[in-house]
């Protein structure tokens, strides 16, 4: 019979592989059926009987076609700094991602070993590089003519308002204060040329960027012996 119509288990022709969704069992020296995702091999094949597959038990899974004797254990429940973005099923492991305002400081194959809070730039410093799923915020001192008066992981340095008559000159952490005549905004040298809504209140609230899609399982990074980066606060 041609190989295509042989039923498992069968002995492959010399030099031939097994077919789709089959594996070669060294003990039986036969091509045998694999188990589908969500199952595992309960009984291995012999020369006369094919693999017997069984469903994975609760909290265990197999993601691939396989002939493993036991399903893999799903990862532990997501910690408080994480969001479960993929539940543990018979066919897939649980995936936890860092919650908004956090980033993955230490990745693993599927997910994240350690989540850490995004750095907040203190007044006088603005965001030079925004945080991503896997990198922290980078802060920089506000250049002359710009300021930031917030402690924030999202705010950039903004240009001082240009006054006809200055009441109080601006500095890196405070806008210029004008006398009663209407001020005009100017893009001072060194200002970040990004659209930024002008807010009348200090933004001390936790920012809520889009939820990260990097799979992660995490613990809070210790603040450790290393000092916080310049212009950042540990909160």
């Amino acid at each position: 019979l041609p190989a295509q119509v042989a039923f498992t288990p069968y002995a492959p022709e010399p030099g031939s592989t097994c077919r789709l969704r089959e594996y070669y069992d060294q003990t039986a020296q036969m091509c045998c059926s694999k188990c589908s995702p969500g199952q595992h091999a309960k009984v291995f094949c012999t020369k006369t009987s094919d693999t017997v597959c069984d469903s994975c038990e609760d909290s265990t899974y197999t993601q691939l076609w396989n002939w493993v004797p036991e399903c893999l254990s799903c990862g532990s429940r997501c910690s408080s700094d994480q969001v479960e973005t993929q539940a543990c099923t018979r066919e897939q492991n649980r995936i936890c991602t860092c919650r908004p305002g956090w980033y993955c400081a230490l990745s693993k194959q599927e997910g994240c070993r350690l989540c850490a809070p995004l750095r907040k730039c203190r007044p006088g410093f603005g965001v030079a590089r925004p945080g991503t799923e896997t990198s922290d915020v980078v802060c920089k001192p506000c250049a002359p003519g710009t300021f930031s008066n917030t402690t924030s992981s999202t705010d950039i340095c903004r240009p001082h308002q240009i006054c006809n008559v200055v009441a109080i000159p601006g500095n890196a952490s405070m806008d210029a204060v004008c006398t009663s005549t209407s001020p005009t905004r100017s893009m001072a040298p060194g200002a970040v040329h990004l659209p930024q809504p002008v807010s009348t209140r200090s933004q001390h609230t936790q920012p809520t960027p889009e939820p990260s899609t990097a799979p992660s399982t995490s613990f809070l990074l210790p603040m450790g012996p290393s000092p916080p980066a310049e212009g950042s606060t540990g909160d």
């Epitope: 190989a3 492959p12 030099g15 031939s16 592989t17 077919r19 789709l20 969704r21 694999k34």
Partner: antibody, heavy 119, light 107 residues
Framework: QVQLVQSGAEVKKPGASVKVSCKAS????????INWVRQAPGQGLEWIGW????????QFNENFKGRVTMTTDTSTSTAYMELRSLRSDDTAVYYC????????????WGQGTTVTVSS | DIQMTPSTSSLSASVGDRVTITCRAS??????LNWYQQKPGKAVKLLIY???KLHSGVPSRFSGSGSGTDFTLTISSLQPEDFATYYC?????????FGGGTKLELK
Amino acid sequence: QVQLVQSGAEVKKPGASVKVSCKASGYTFITYDINWVRQAPGQGLEWIGWIYPRDGNTQFNENFKGRVTMTTDTSTSTAYMELRSLRSDDTAVYYCARGDRDYGYFDVWGQGTTVTVSS
Amino acid sequence: DIQMTPSTSSLSASVGDRVTITCRASQDISNYLNWYQQKPGKAVKLLIYFKSKLHSGVPSRFSGSGSGTDFTLTISSLQPEDFATYYCQQGNTLPLTFGGGTKLELK
């Protein structure tokens, strides 16, 4: 990145043989099947067979059995497909492609090698 | 051998259109249906495998559906780079076989 780079075009006479090479990079060569697929001018795609580089074992489309040989050189991560007793209807673009044996798909393809059989 | 037959060999559409390309298998292939894109002078690209699983790096405007013998590739909003030839392929049984291809052209 994962890449398959094939040898250049060939012109052969009927009855001759052709050997096409396919150099893999960007992944562990021995852990994936290399498949060979051909496409005659203006036609669809036709699967020729696969080779598993770890042990050199093969699986062929019955239409090509006896006329095709697939080999690999694991030291250079290169796969070869030799087709013998060429006929004019073997004129085609021959592709190598990395395959998945569980779902039967080809996820990375070479750029193709044109083989022309003409007297 | 399992024959794979596209419903049409060519299809005209405009940028922004929702396009569906269908493929029929001569016998039940469960969900073992894969879709590919081919452009002249370019390497063939896997789009979808196992009926509906999107291959990594493929835009989410591509989706797959169907089961048994009838399958559909849908492009939700056609982009200029999507004009190409599309092939279905069954991964259920050896020999692996492809459909004849559907050429998607600009209307």
